[in-house]
Amino acid sequence: AYYQQLNTELKENLKDTMTKRYHQPGHEAVTSAVDQLQQEFHCCGSNNSQDWRDSEWIRSQEAGGRVVPDSCCKTVVALCGQRDHASNIYKVEGGCITKLETFIQEHLR
């Protein structure tokens, strides 16, 4: 029951966090956590990399033409997030949610 509740909350909150809080002032800890999540779990976006299209930061001029954060890149270099291509970006079926689900299953069960 605990796992199920955690899983539901993750699904509901991760995309919201990524779209509304990522790279926003005062949310540096969230930004850092999302970047770490994407790099360590080799994923991009909540469900897939296209989730980033709804991000307030990605849609703003401040993102410098990025379509995904640089932390989605297999090799992180400045502005690498401008190219949303499988050779460059972690394109995992199910995005970071799937990776997190697997991690939680392995560590909480």
Partner: antibody, heavy 118, light 111 residues
């Protein structure tokens, strides 16, 4: 050409309120994050408010929180700063500003002067 | 809050000399290989003007006489050769952690 024009600055008594406006032109306003930065008479620069491009996220330093409210009207290309419970230390030139890409405030208006004094 | 300490508070140089302004942050302003430090120039009666962003990138239209360097907590702005037009106050600013903060400024005077 990017143009930011502030207005609304005035002489106001401590405890009073004031609403500043910033009219933007020459760029796609709705895709730009916006901030208000003020400069005290001693020339010190302070970042006082931020709003995301869509207006979803706002940020205020602790010295400002609860007294000032930043908002925007993307349909009218206008940024606002509602200032309440004004103190003498809020006396400053208030600038409307925005980044171009990445970090740093690339675009600045000419400023509007707010004087809080009895 | 990240405190930025600029030095010197003022400096007077002759034309053609090199100006070096330092900015020290109370915590690192680096993130993902980028130093989130900016430099501005403010002339009398004008708003600040962005010169350098992300520590070393020269803003479009800014003369090559201006350069920025540094990482972590220590940064510097160099102007060489100094020209008459450089008479101004120079500020550093970090955008690593909110609230974004500015240094106290360095006034450059021409001898």
């Amino acid at each position: 050409e990017v143009k930011l024009v502030e207005s609304g600055g005035d002489l106001v008594q401590p405890g009073g309120s004031l609403k500043l406006s910033c009219a933007a032109s020459g760029f796609t306003f709705s895709t730009y994050t916006m901030s208000w930065v003020r400069q005290t008479p001693e020339k010190r620069l302070e970042w006082v408010a931020y709003i995301s491009s869509g207006g979803v996220t706002t940020y205020y330093p602790d010295t400002i929180k609860g007294r000032f409210t930043i908002s925007r009207d993307n349909a009218k290309n206008t940024l606002f700063l509602q200032m309440n419970s004004l103190k003498s230390e809020d006396t400053a030139m208030y600038y409307c500003t925005s980044p171009r890409t990445g970090t740093g405030f690339a675009y600045w208006g000419q400023g509007t002067l707010v004087t809080v004094s009895a | 809050d990240i405190v930025l300490t600029q030095s010197p508070a003022s400096l007077a140089l002759s034309l053609g000399q090199r100006a070096t302004i330092s900015c020290r942050a109370s915590a690192s302003v680096d993130y993902y290989g980028t130093s989130l430090m900016q430099w501005y120039q403010q002339k009398p009666g004008q708003p600040p003007k962005l010169l350098i962003y992300e520590a070393s990138n020269v803003e479009s239209g800014v003369p090559a006489r201006f350069s920025g360097s540094g990482s972590g907590t220590d940064f510097s702005l160099n102007i060489h050769p100094v020209e008459e037009d450089d008479l101004a106050i120079y500020f550093c600013q970090q955008s690593r952690k909110a609230p974004y903060t500015f240094g106290g400024g360095t006034k450059l005077e021409i001898k």
